[in-house]
């Protein structure tokens, strides 16, 4: 059920998964001058049961110059730090994928990790897009792409996002002179939350084992 291709590229936009479906793999890559420890994991795998998902295996890097004397530091899985047993959802808030069964949060960094992360996504994975600095979205609502299985092949849906350049005079997209207001919250901003049904998690299943490689700059 691995996705064949990478998520679509949108000009002047980057994308990120808010959570990773069970079955997602993350390559254990080390930065220059370091390598995986001998007998170390090749990848981390998002696994779980009906109530809890977490990353199996742990990536460990050691200096290429040393044999095997380097002390390794293993960070705590992010699920243990961040997972809440119950998270109250505001009725106007979209579902937080990472709080649902069957999804792992972003894995925490490991020591001497490469700057680029290579993910292998599975069917049902959703990624969200955001325009890069200096560009604004024509529509600010969430722009997502989902890996779907149709007729035995996987494909990513096309995100509805156009990032347009701004005049050089503005600091960054949307910069304008704000109106003065006596209190912290401007009067025009009282009830402006946008909702959409597109947030619902895709639950399609599939049965293909071809690989999709996705690289992302890890911040």
């Amino acid at each position: 059920e691995l996705c064949d291709d990478d998520p679509p590229e949108i000009p002047h936009a980057t994308f990120k998964a808010m959570a990773y479906k069970e079955g997602t793999m993350l390559n254990c890559e080390c930065k220059r001058g370091f390598r995986r420890i001998k007998s170390g994991s090749l990848y981390m795998l998002c696994t779980g049961n009906s109530s809890h998902s977490s990353w199996d295996n742990q990536c460990q890097c050691t200096s290429s110059a040393t044999r095997n004397t380097t002390k390794q530091v293993t960070p705590q899985p992010e699920e243990q730090k961040e997972r809440k047993t119950t998270e109250m959802q505001s009725p106007m808030q979209p579902v937080d994928q990472a709080s649902l069964p069957g999804h792992c949060r972003e894995p925490p960094p490991w020591e001497n990790e490469a700057t680029e992360r290579i993910y292998h996504f599975v069917v049902g994975q959703m990624v969200y897009y955001q325009c890069v600095q200096g560009y604004r979205a024509l529509h600010r609502g969430p722009a997502e792409s989902v890996c779907k299985m149709t007729h035995g092949k996987t494909r990513w849906t096309q995100p509805q996002l156009i990032c347009t350049g701004e005049m050089e005079t503005s600091q960054f997209p949307g910069e304008e002179k704000p109106q003065a207001s006596p209190e912290g919250r401007p009067e025009s901003e009282t009830s402006c939350l946008v909702t959409t049904t597109d947030f619902q998690i895709q639950t399609e299943m599939a049965a293909t084992m071809e690989t999709s490689i996705f690289t992302t700059e890890y911040q």
Partner: nanobody
Framework: QVQLVESGGGLVQAGGSLRLSCAAT????????MGWFRRAPGKEREFVAA????????YFADSVKGRFTISRDNGKNMVYLQMNSLKPEDTAVYYC????????????????????WGQGTQVTVSS
């Protein structure tokens, strides 16, 4: 009920540092762009800094670039503003704000993009 609570303000001498914190409750924090704004006495509200929900982008007003940094901790539902090399003109009430739109497909420096606001914390920089 969305609540943003700022802390960390105070009186500091010019050249000093302060770290402002903003605790968010009642919203899915990791899905929102977060920003800091400020209002000096007798002036209009001014954008200071923002950080995107995907933590891939941080933006700063020209007046604070190189002096202020913004960060967030999605595990603790916190956003921070580290202010170094403070100047008297940085004196203002600083407000934490959350974007109207979860998973917004861009960032904005305009106050109208932010629908949730804290009560503010006073920062005074003496010369």
């Amino acid at each position: 009920q969305v609540q943003l609570v700022e802390s960390g303000g105070g009186l500091v001498q010019a050249g000093g540092s302060l770290r402002l914190s903003c605790a968010a409750t009642g919203l899915t924090f990791r899905q929102h762009n977060m920003g800091w704004f400020r209002r000096a006495p007798g002036k209009e509200r001014e954008f200071v800094a923002a950080i995107s929900w995907n933590v891939g982008s941080t933006y700063f007003a020209d007046s604070v670039k190189g002096r202020f940094t913004i960060s967030r901790d999605n595990g603790k539902n916190m956003v921070y503003l580290q202010m170094n090399s403070l100047k008297p003109e940085d004196t203002a009430v600083y407000y934490c704000a959350a974007d109207n739109i979860p998973l917004a497909s861009d960032m904005r420096a305009t106050a109208t993009a932010y629908g949730y606001w804290g009560q503010g914390t006073q920062v005074t920089v003496s010369s």
